[in-house]
């Protein structure tokens, strides 16, 4: 599985777990199907994941949600790729926007993201949604992750 | 293109094709402007790729589909990116949800689906939906394939 | 950062770009939190990627917009992701349709694009949407990018 | 909580037909192969048959080859065995089982959840 000891395979792939925090960041275990290359990419605190090298990244990210027009705010469900670099602020990389549907009790839509970007070591990307207890958390339906090329 | 004769790069991109057939599994096929890098990753039965190493690959598939809320069930649209290895069950890998249009006749609407997963030798994953009638065919709408890391 | 001299690491991430112009194609910008590799990879006349090596690319887009199902065409909503090969007419790799929203003033919805192909020297990507005056250029809503495998 | 709930069975005539259901609850069903197996009276457990995750695959005991069919409605979460052709051997507490995600499909045995069962009894 190695590309040499010098540059060893680093990916990771999680999936989403629901939470009884209030925070509008989405938490993730090592569970069913995940994947966690190695040492060198960490999910920390549940929420984000950490990489230990510098180098460029396709990060991704899937969420499914449920929700309905009349229930919801008037804004859209918007999920946030973002990234928190050692010492400095946290800033968004990636977001996606779907407006709530009318189907009732919710309407179930699914986003993705992905891109790819430069990452520090030390440097941490996690995911922000607007609501989270709209997350739909069945097999497969939401996930984040990532690969160093 | 070789990384080198141990390591061949490995990536497969495959085209939709309509069918027939009523299983709700999609069939592909190499036409169009597909990939298919070498031996070491096949499309079996116009319905899987089956890959021959094991390691960690980026699998992805794109759905784009058209339906309308009162022609369809009331569950929503569902695509699932499957994984079958040998001697196992299939097992979901990733899902998208989306809930049927008001639009009519119908409303057309995509889904991509994509992941870093671990897969054995004569590993095979598939797409599965819940209405392959309503899957949109034409050039570009939906397509599927991964690529080894 | 190098996977060696001969094989350079080869990506890129660029940003959306609001535009006067009426064309369909939509412009982007090395802007924000971008990426570009190496002059391997360039964004011409800001509105295509160009490479200059042979080889198996992974090729995304992520479009977001904001429409309305009254304001706008009957038509949906479609995002093309285009190739351009020298002393070839372009063609399709990839296309995404959603349907307008009925949401006052224009509901937003995401849509993303990826998937492997083969790319001679010169050829150039480059995204087309319906209706670029829906596109929603706000921080990481749209982006489009690529990377060598 | 997992739960799964048997129903349908009862007393039938040699040669009649019987279709036992499962009402399962408390996981994301349609991500699990599940089976039938059954007890008979003073005998040992026999798995009866399989059905993959998404209703793909199907396996069954040479026994009961033929005979019956196992089928999955993920949207109403309920797995099902249409029993034809029944025989008294075929007499039984039958019992629907959940199987780990991925499971093997030569192992029968090594199931997560079973239901309380329910008896089908062939008899003229």
């Known amino acids: 599985m190695q590309k040499g000891d010098q540059n060893p395979q680093i990916a990771a792939h999680v999936i989403s777990e629901a939470s009884s925090k209030t925070t509008s960041v989405l938490q993730w275990a090592e569970k069913g199907y995940y994947t966690m290359s190695n040492n060198l990419v960490t999910l920390e605190n549940g929420k984000q994941l950490t990489v230990k090298r510098q180098g460029l990244y396709y990060i991704y990210a899937q969420v499914t949600f449920c929700s309905n027009r009349e229930a919801s705010s008037q804004a859209p469900f918007i999920a946030s790729l973002c990234l928190k670099s050692p010492g400095r602020f946290e800033r968004i990389l990636l977001r996606a926007a779907n407006t709530h549907s009318s189907a009732k009790p919710c309407g179930q839509q699914s986003i993705h993201l992905g891109g790819v970007f430069e990452l520090q070591p030390g440097a941490s990307v996690f995911v922000n949604v607007t609501d989270p207890s709209q997350v739909s958390h069945g097999t497969g339906f939401t996930s984040f992750g990532l690969l160093k090329l | 293109m070789q990384k080198g004769d141990q390591n061949p790069q490995i990536a497969a991109h495959v085209i939709s094709e309509a069918s027939s057939k009523t299983t709700s599994v999609l069939q592909w096929a190499e036409k169009g402007y597909y990939t298919m890098s070498n031996n070491l990753v096949t499309l079996e039965n116009g319905k899987q790729l089956t890959v021959k190493r094991q390691g960690l690959y980026y699998i992805y598939a794109q759905v784009t589909f058209c339906s309308n809320r009162e022609a369809s069930s009331q569950a929503p649209f569902i695509a699932s990116l499957c994984l079958k290895s040998p001697g196992r069950f299939e097992r979901i890998l990733l899902r998208a949800a989306n809930t049927h249009s008001s639009a009519k006749p119908c409303g057309q609407q995509s889904i991509h689906l994509g992941g870093v997963f671990e897969l054995q030798p004569g590993a095979s994953v598939f797409v599965n939906v819940t209405d392959p009638s309503q899957v949109s065919h034409g050039t570009g709408f939906t397509s599927f394939g991964l690529l080894k890391l | 950062m190098q996977k060696g001299d001969q094989n350079p690491q080869i990506a890129a991430h660029v940003i959306s770009e609001a535009s006067s112009k009426t064309t369909s194609v939509l412009q982007w910008a090395e802007k924000g939190y971008y990426t570009m590799s190496n002059n391997l990879v360039t964004l011409e006349n800001g509105k295509q990627l160009t490479v200059k090596r042979q080889g198996l690319y992974y090729i995304y887009a992520q479009v977001t917009f904001c429409s309305n199902r009254e304001a706008s065409s009957q038509a949906p909503f479609i995002a093309s992701l285009c190739l351009k090969s020298p002393g070839r007419f372009e063609r399709i790799l990839l296309r995404a349709a959603n349907t307008h929203s009925s949401a006052k003033p224009c509901g937003q919805q995401s849509i993303h694009l990826g998937g492997v192909f083969e790319l001679q020297p010169g050829a150039s990507v480059f995204v087309n949407v319906t209706d670029p005056s829906q596109v929603s250029h706000g921080t990481g809503f749209t982006s489009f990018g690529l990377l060598k495998l | 909580e997992v739960q799964l709930l048997e129903s349908g069975g009862g007393l039938v005539q040699p040669g009649g037909s019987l279709r036992l259901s499962c009402a399962a609850s408390?996981?994301?069903?349609?991500?699990?192969?599940m089976s039938w197996v059954r007890q008979a009276p003073g005998k040992g457990l026999e798995w009866v048959s399989s059905i993959s995750p998404l209703g793909l695959w199907t396996y069954y005991a040479d026994s009961v080859k033929g005979r019956f069919t196992i089928s999955r409605d993920n949207s109403k979460n309920t797995l099902y065995l249409q029993m034809n052709s029944l025989r008294a051997e075929d007499t039984a507490v039958y019992y629907c089982?959940?199987?780990?995600?991925?499971?093997?499909?030569?192992?029968?045995?090594?199931?997560?959840?079973w239901g309380q069962g329910t008896l089908v009894t062939v008899s003229s």
């Open positions: 408390g996981f994301t069903f349609e991500a699990y192969p």
């Open positions: 089982a959940k199987l780990s995600a991925g499971a093997e499909t030569h192992v029968y045995r090594l199931f997560d959840y």
